[in-house]
């Protein structure tokens, strides 16, 4: 309920609990197509990873908006895309074929882990520096859907390994707050 995602039309999209809408491609985004920037699909001959077949991470880079404010730097986020197991014969590790049944377990390419990133906002005429945190997908995975699964899993947070360094923030009186590198890169 609390998490909000950004769109580039200066409107905040406020998804419901457990939702994190996939951003549509927009003019001022750069999108790395899966074959260039995404994680390559697992090898189809690896039986244990057959459910991960062609789950891709698409990278979007965009400036985020919040009301009239814009992020000082673009933010890169992932969108999960692709099929988890094509509806055809899949060879397994010892040469036999395994039929992917449509009525079998439902695997989906969905967010596996999330991170939150602190973003410095630049606002028109605003004297005070403003920041916000955005929830971003950190990785994707094919997961068996249960009735508890939604489009994404709100509570499925995994800590990032890198700890950010504490940086000096702009002081309250500073006019036209400059972006602070440490603040922009405070990803969890």
């Amino acid at each position: 309920q609390g998490w909000q995602a950004f769109r580039n039309d200066a409107t905040e999209v406020i998804p419901g609990l457990g939702e994190y809408p996939e951003p549509p491609p927009e003019n001022n985004q750069t999108m790395n197509r899966a074959e260039n920037g995404g994680r390559p699909p697992h090898h189809p001959y690896d039986a244990k990873d057959v459910s991960e077949y062609s789950c891709r991470e698409l990278h979007y880079t965009r400036f985020l908006t919040d009301g009239p404010c814009r992020s000082a730097k673009p933010v890169t986020e992932l969108v999960c895309s692709g099929q988890c197991g094509p509806a055809r014969l899949l060879p397994n590790a010892i040469g036999r074929v395994k039929w992917w049944r449509p009525n079998g377990p439902d695997f989906r390419c969905i967010p596996d882990r999330y991170r939150a990133q602190r973003v410095q906002l630049l606002c028109p005429g605003g004297a005070a520096p403003r920041s916000r945190k955005v929830r971003l997908v950190a990785s994707c995975k094919c997961k068996r859907l249960t009735r508890f699964h939604n489009q994404s899993e709100l509570k499925d947070f995994g800590p990032e390994t890198a700890r950010p360094q504490k940086g000096r923030k702009p002081r309250p009186g500073a006019r036209g707050a400059k972006a602070n590198q440490a603040e922009l890169e405070n990803a969890y």
Partner: antibody, heavy 118, light 107 residues
């Protein structure tokens, strides 16, 4: 479901300090900013400051600089606000609030009444 | 500090009435204004931010408008649960400041 549960009422003498706690559930505390706002009896709301639990960053309202300290324990998802050198004018309900931004207060605790009296 | 002056300080209205509360900033705050609702003995609740954006779950009868120094919160058709005190807040310049509140009472 986001919930903020604050510690109980306190009665303090002038010159003493008070430490109010705010237990956050529904998300990890470090994914938000923590704010503190107070309200004197029959009065309006007064912003005290915010903190970023992830990096220990804080910003205090100038009125409270030097008297207030905001900290968090991310292992228990609890925020703390300590106010020192209490005076009678500090008698108020103290609210913790949380939000994705440093400037608005999305979810609030139930409030903690602090009475300063000799 | 930027002063936020709310008017009226209190008003009486009936269920179904259209209610308008105004907030005037002592200097230009662009659209950096939020509105909160507070019921007796309870914590405030966020209603509106960026002057006109409704927060999650806030009924559409609540709307905000304005920019610069003059802001308005409108309740298009007052409901029994809307009797409360309403506060505006500016976040254009430190430190964030609130208006004095407008108490909406039953006529």
């Amino acid at each position: 479901q986001v919930q903020l549960v604050q510690s109980g009422a306190e009665v303090k003498k002038p010159g003493a300090s008070v430490k109010v706690s705010c237990k956050v559930s529904g998300f990890p505390i470090k994914h938000h900013f923590q704010h503190w706002v107070r309200q004197a009896p029959g009065k309006g709301l007064e912003w005290m400051g915010w903190s970023d639990p992830e990096i220990g960053d804080t910003e205090y309202a100038s009125k409270f600089q030097g008297r207030v300290t905001m900290t968090e324990d991310t292992s228990t998802d609890t925020a703390y606000m300590e106010l020192s050198s209490l005076r009678s004018e500090d008698t108020a309900v103290y609210y913790c609030a949380t939000g994705h931004t440093t400037y608005k207060f999305d979810f609030w605790g139930q409030g903690t009444t602090v009475t300063v009296s000799s | 500090d930027i002063q936020m002056t709310q008017s009226p300080s209190s008003l009486s209205a009936s269920v179904g009435d259209r209610v308008t509360i105004t907030c005037k900033a002592s200097q230009d705050v662009h659209t950096a204004v939020a509105w909160y609702q507070q019921k007796p003995g309870k914590a405030p609740k966020l209603l509106i931010y960026w002057a006109s954006t409704r927060w999650t779950g806030v009924p559409s009868r609540f709307s905000g408008s304005g920019s610069g120094t003059d802001f308005t919160l409108t309740i298009s058709s007052l409901q029994p649960e809307d009797f409360a005190t309403y506060y505006c807040q500016q976040y254009s310049d430190y430190h964030w400041t609130f208006g004095g509140g407008t108490k909406v009472e039953i006529k």
